[in-house]
């Protein structure tokens, strides 16, 4: 069918809960593309009718809620004007008995997200909630060993639970819960988190890793158009900003009048443990003054640069 397979994602999910997966793969999905979801090898696309339990919502596939029979491989097909890409998502659905008093046990959290708190530090846990904007998510509540968390050491900050002065007693089974409203119907989302405590000194916050560039030079002809991506991996829901700077100034500010060099719109791909961010810098026309100047990609405390240089003369032309 001429579509290029990009990658396979595996997701293990709890039955009777809403679930959503977004089909994004920058830079492919940042342009003019159409996205269509299919189940297994079916030629019939997933419904776009919002009343359907399983339906496509823009680039998302949305299950309201997940059921046993929904396990399987789903394909998302991204069609551009001259391209076709396909992402495979393998969903495995199973039953969970969280804190059901009639069953009387703690939830089996072994296969859920595992997070770490640093002993003696102020730290945080993250509730991973990824749904399209047609879903309104109610306030997040946090539970530890089936009891709602309260106390001066804890603060709910957006999707985070802040924990001050972490102690050994903070290890255990946590869950974050929110009510999801979609088309007037309400569903409960409950995510389990196994929390362990480490004494190893953790860095403050998250330190992003710049995959590209790597403090190097790029040969480019005078007058050409150049686009360079800055690729950054960082923790989910991080607070770091990513940008391009020159002479310690944002490129959009530095070239505010001419707009010859601009920063692009940031995009990201969400993985289970981290996000991959891409923000590009576009030189509409490379000029002499651009050569030898470090153009810096900043991501939180991390930096990396590119330096433009003229190509070596090609003497074969003479």
């Amino acid at each position: 069918d001429g579509c290029k397979d990009i990658f396979m994602k595996n997701e293990i999910l709890s039955a009777s809960q809403p679930f959503a997966f977004n089909c994004t793969f920058p830079p492919i999905t940042s342009g003019e593309v159409s996205v269509t979801w299919y189940k297994n090898s079916s030629k019939i696309p997933v419904s776009k009718i919002i009343q359907s339990r399983i339906h496509q919502d823009e680039t998302w596939i949305l299950f309201l809620p997940m059921e046993w029979g929904d396990s399987g491989v789903y394909q998302c097909v991204i069609k551009g004007r001259d391209s076709c890409h396909r992402i495979h998502v393998n969903l495995t659905v199973f039953e969970k008995h969280w804190c059901d008093t009639s069953i009387g046990g703690l939830p089996n959290l072994s296969d859920e997200y595992k997070q770490i708190l640093h002993l003696g530090k102020d730290d945080s846990l993250t509730c991973h909630l990824h749904f399209p904007k047609s879903c309104v998510l109610g306030p997040i509540k946090w539970y530890k060993d089936c009891n709602e968390i309260k106390g001066e050491r804890f603060t709910v900050l957006e999707t985070r639970l802040l924990v001050s002065n972490v102690s050994a007693e903070d290890r255990g089974n946590y869950a974050c819960q929110a009510i999801l409203t979609h088309s007037g119907k309400q569903y409960e989302v409950l995510n389990g988190i196994t929390v362990s405590i480490t004494e190893r000194a953790g860095y403050g916050g998250s330190v992003p890793k710049i995959i590209y560039p790597k403090n190097h030079s790029i040969e480019v002809q005078l007058g050409t158009t150049l686009i360079v991506d800055c690729n950054v991996t960082d923790t989910k829901d991080n607070t770091n900003l990513r940008c391009w700077r020159v002479n310690n100034t944002l490129v959009d500010d530095y070239y505010d009048e001419s707009k010859r060099i601009r920063e692009g719109v940031e995009t990201h791909v969400s993985f289970r443990e981290h996000n991959l961010y891409t923000v590009n810098i576009t030189f509409l026309e490379v000029k002499m003054e651009d050569y030898g100047l470090p153009f810096m990609c900043h991501a939180g405390v991390s930096t990396a640069y590119i330096i433009l240089q003229l190509p070596a003369p090609d003497f074969r032309a003479y």
């Epitope: 998510l137 001050s164 403050g204 916050g205 607070t239 719109v265």
Partner: antibody, heavy 117, light 107 residues
């Protein structure tokens, strides 16, 4: 809970420097997040001034950048705002706030600073 | 800077009425849109973050929607305690900017 307390002089003379401090309790300012200053002139809307991040990075609103400095004292879990060459237009309630991944989630109660001779 | 245009600037409604406030961004903000409530003499309080997520303790009568450049905020049944000024704010591009505010009063 994370809580904030702004402090500093309520009256500053024109052309002088406005100095305010925000004391944070309940969470270390070096642990994560961005720690912000926002202001609101009487009867008007809100204006973001700038932040200092957990790592010490700063970012300022370009409209105030030439006059603003935000610093921190990690031993006291405080961050501070200095705004130089003030005029009557800088009269406002100044708030400190934590920014999570998306929003200014929690705010101090604010302190009114009047610029007048 | 991204301009945030809020409308209306003020409105008067009866208890139990449905109230809608809109916010338009001058550029694409990728859903990084927050709503705050401010009562006289108090600090703003976060109500909604990232377009569609209700902050801790916020009642379900507050209902958000929107994407791209246009966002709305609805109070399904206005209560006396909802009398306040409401602000939208974009958190996508520095400098972070606020709308001009919408003052909600009871008829």
């Amino acid at each position: 809970d994370v809580q904030f307390q702004e402090s500093g002089p309520g009256l500053v003379k024109p052309s002088q420097t406005l100095s305010l401090t925000c004391t944070v309790t309940g969470y270390s300012i070096t642990a994560d997040f961005a720690w912000n200053w926002i202001r609101q002139p009487p009867g008007k809307g809100l204006e973001w001034i700038g932040y200092i991040s957990y790592s010490g990075d700063t970012n300022y609103n370009p409209s105030l950048k030439s006059r603003v400095t935000i610093t921190r004292d990690t031993s006291k879990n405080q961050f501070s705002l200095k705004l130089s060459s003030v005029t009557a237009a800088d009269t406002a309630v100044y708030f400190c706030a934590i920014r999570g991944p998306y929003s200014f989630t929690y705010w101090g109660q604010g302190t009114l600073v009047t610029v007048s001779s | 800077d991204i301009q945030m245009t809020q409308s209306p600037s003020s409105l008067s409604a009866s208890v139990g009425d449905r109230v809608t406030i809109t916010c338009r961004a001058s550029q694409w903000i990728n859903n990084y849109l927050n709503w705050y409530q401010q009562k006289p003499g108090k600090a703003p309080k976060l109500l909604i973050y990232y377009t569609s997520m209700l902050h801790s303790g916020v009642p379900s009568r507050f209902s958000p929607s929107g994407s791209g450049n246009d966002y709305t905020f609805t109070i399904s049944s206005l209560q006396p305690e909802d009398i306040a000024t409401y602000y939208c704010q974009q958190g996508h591009t520095l400098p972070w900017t606020f709308g001009g505010g919408t003052k909600v009063e009871i008829k």
